[in-house]
Interface confidence: low
């Protein structure tokens, strides 16, 4: 836990001769801002720098080179990572005065003369003076208003609804605020605000519509920040509906939207009497045209076994909404044909999922599958490979007899997915050929021996033994084996 | 306008001692800012070395921190830094450089045009 | 330390193209990024601050953007001043670091 930052000078005021220089320096164990009581836009005599020291704490000064009743206000110093929207500031604070003969009261924004209360609650009326010396008095139709008064703060009190005025004397001089206007509000202790974009993917040419509606709140603000708003590109509409309660539904609209109107799009609602803040936001996006984007689950080569159920699953991202289809080996699937069905469903606003289901697996499944996804704009297509897995098994096994020569060739043929893979063994004791320890293995480089092997399509070999001479009653067995299984044979 | 201009000897012994001066015209270095030098080795990328700020309060990369030392010597508005037992590795173009800390954020406005030091026997 | 990585490391691009170079930083390092462009045998000069600022004098065809721990710097049409090697460099923690540099080259 960091102690709380210390402010230089060590003061809880301070008053500041008009027009002169002040300088106000905040030390802290971590990185620290200021907060003061200008905008932005009014402080370019108001300058934040951080400063090096020894002392191993981080120093940031706030400067001002000429003191005017704007001036006048809390500052506050504060660590970077404690500040929060909703929270007022942590910190350490001065308030500075700036008496200007001439402005006896700081200066305010025109909403700062809005005061709005709740049924008897009690409210602030924000006339602060810009010397802690002035009296102040507050004044309605009815004449004095007795409130409690504090320069830093103004006039507190529990008002009826009406015009109030401050008023101050400076030096003989007598000084009137311009009216402010308290108003009773009926409002929630907090804000209930939704947000609805029915669509969050548009393409050029096309009107972003978002709304947010404001619930049990009679007079809210409600401002929106959106790519095209500097520009004043989008429409706003307030619409109030009363029955069965109060709702206010604030409508933004984008006409002729271009990929310059992508971005967030933020409604923020501010209750008028309380600092109740809410905040919705999604994310719009804009393409140039329409498109479509594919993403298989799975890669451009899969097997399936033989009787197996399989689902391939295709995610497909597009706008406008895509026509899904699938072909095999380029033809369309006819689903009532085949133990094969497809479906599209709906995940999200562009977001759409495709399934191609084998439910009994067939060698005539093997081939190629595409799904082709197609809207208006764009027309993209994925193609993979389908395998059906078949364990080997042997088809044939025969010998063939060279005559006179005395060579003999044995032939073995084998099926199956992948291509089965052939070996040979021998025998040389036919007595004993029942125990399986008196089977060898043929080697490749026994010289009188040869052995080959090909394939004759997808799912077909042929493997072959030449002896060039036979002078013993041998057995020979033929081993067809892959992935899924191994069968053999002898003779 | 504030110019920095880098000063000393190009050749050094291992183990000797590095010694290079910036001098500071148009501008007092007890006014403002951090006064930094920055190496940059043949053919490679930038390193930081370290600053003696306006009050005189010093910084070091952590990486050289025992062997560097940065001075100024007000009077003649020039800051120097010295590096010992200096190797191979040290051999770089050293750059003084004025360090801004407007915007509360720090960055290396102006520069000196740099200086070559070779370490070799 | 903060480590600052760039990309690519070189690039050849023509005098009219669009040059877009990115940094990484080891570490969040909010929008604390400066971009330097330096000449060979010239010292650094100061483009950009503060992620996206631009440096008095700079010209507005180069623009930075980023925050977090990836930044870009784009040049959106290349002028024959602008071959050089350009760096990043993190202000968000001691000791600063810079990238390893992109040179850019003519075409």
């Known amino acids: 836990q960091l102690s709380l930052p210390s402010i230089l000078p060590n003061e809880n005021e301070k008053v500041v001769q008009l027009n002169s220089s002040f300088s106000l320096r905040c030390f802290g164990e971590s990185e620290v801002s200021w907060q003061y009581p200008m905008s932005e836009e009014e402080s370019s005599d108001v300058e934040i720098r951080n400063e090096e020291n020894n002392s191993g704490l981080f120093v940031t000064v706030l400067e001002v080179s000429s003191a005017s009743a704007a001036h006048t206000g809390l500052y506050t110093c504060y660590y970077n990572h404690t500040q929060t929207e909703e929270n007022e500031l942590e910190g350490r604070h001065i308030y500075i005065y700036v008496p200007d003969p001439d402005v006896a009261f700081v200066p305010l924004g025109m909403t700062d003369y809005l005061v709005i209360v709740e049924d008897d609650d009690s409210a602030i009326i924000p006339c602060r003076t810009t010397d802690p010396e002035t009296p102040v008095t507050l004044h309605n139709s009815e004449g004095v208003v007795p409130a409690s008064y504090d320069s830093r703060q103004g006039f507190n009190g529990t008002f009826t609804v009406g015009p109030y005025i401050c008023e101050a004397t400076v030096k003989g001089k007598k000084f009137q605020t311009i009216p402010f206007n308290v108003y009773a509000l009926k409002a929630t202790s907090e804000l209930d605000l939704e947000m609805e974009a029915l669509k969050t993917v548009y393409k050029s040419g096309e009107t972003i519509v978002v709304t947010c509606a404001v619930f049990n709140n009679e007079v809210v603000d409600l401002q929106w920040t959106y790519p095209g708003e500097v520009k004043g590109k989008g429409i706003t509409m307030l619409e109030e509906i009363k029955v069965p309660s109060i709702k206010l539904v604030y409508t933004l609209t984008v006409p002729e939207a271009t990929v310059k109107d992508s971005g967030d799009y933020e409604c923020a609602a501010r209750q008028a009497t309380r600092e109740v803040k809410e905040m919705k936001k999604v994310t719009i996006s804009v393409h140039e045209k329409g498109f479509i984007e594919i993403k298989p689950t799975f890669s451009q080569l899969e097997a399936v076994n033989l009787h197996e159920v399989k689902h391939f699953v295709v995610e497909v991202r597009a706008y406008p909404p895509p026509r899904i289809s699938w072909l095999k080996n380029n033809l369309t699937l006819i689903e009532n044909l085949t133990e094969i069905t497809t479906d599209v469903e709906k995940i999200q606003e562009i977001r759409y999922r495709s399934k191609l289901k084998l439910i009994r697996a067939k060698e005539e499944d093997s081939g190629h599958y595409t799904i082709v996804a197609q809207n208006e704009d764009a027309v993209k297509s994925y193609t993979f490979e389908l395998l059906t897995q078949v364990p080997s098994s042997i088809l044939d096994l025969v010998d063939d007899h060279h005559g006179s020569t005395g060579g003999q060739t044995v032939r073995c043929t084998a099926e199956g997915t992948p291509l089965p893979d052939i070996e040979w063994m021998i025998c040389k004791d036919i007595k004993k050929c029942n125990n399986e320890t008196s089977w060898t293995i043929l080697a490749n480089n026994v010289s009188n021996i040869i052995t080959e092997i090909h394939s004759r399509d997808r799912s077909t070999v042929e493997g072959r033994v030449t002896f060039a001479k036979v002078e013993e009653t041998i057995a020979v067995r033929c081993l067809a084996k892959n992935l899924l299984g191994a069968e053999n044979r002898e003779l | 306008d504030v110019q920095l201009q880098e000063s000393g000897p190009g050749l050094v012994k291992p183990s000797q001692t590095l010694s290079l001066t910036c001098t500071v015209s148009?501008?007092?270095?007890?006014?403002?800012?951090?006064w930094n030098w920055i190496r940059q080795p043949p053919g490679k990328g930038l390193e930081w070395v370290g600053y003696?700020?306006?009050?005189?309060?010093?910084s070091y990369n952590p990486s050289l921190k025992s062997r560097i030392s940065i001075t100024r010597d007000t009077s003649k508005n020039q800051f120097s830094l010295k590096l010992s037992s200096v190797t191979a590795a040290d051999t770089a173009v050293y750059y003084c450089a004025r360090r801004d800390y407007r915007y509360g954020y720090w960055y290396f406005d102006v520069w000196g045009a740099g200086t070559t030091v070779t370490v070799s026997s | 330390d903060i480590q600052m990585n760039q990309s690519p490391s070189s690039v050849s691009a023509s005098v009219g193209d669009r040059v877009t170079i990115t940094c990484h930083a080891s570490q969040n390092i909010h929008v604390w990024l400066t971009w330097y462009q330096q000449k060979p045998g010239k010292a650094p000069k100061l483009l950009i601050y503060k992620a996206s600022n631009l440096h008095t004098g700079v010209p507005s065809r180069f623009s930075g953007s980023g925050s977090g721990t990836d930044f870009t710097l784009t040049i959106s049409s290349l002028q024959p001043e602008d071959f050089a090697t350009y760096y990043c460099q993190q202000g968000q923690s001691y000791p600063w670091t810079f990238g390893g540099g992109t040179k850019l080259e003519i075409k």
């Open positions: 003696i700020s306006y009050s005189g309060s010093t």
């Open positions: 148009g501008y007092s270095i007890t006014s403002d800012y951090a």
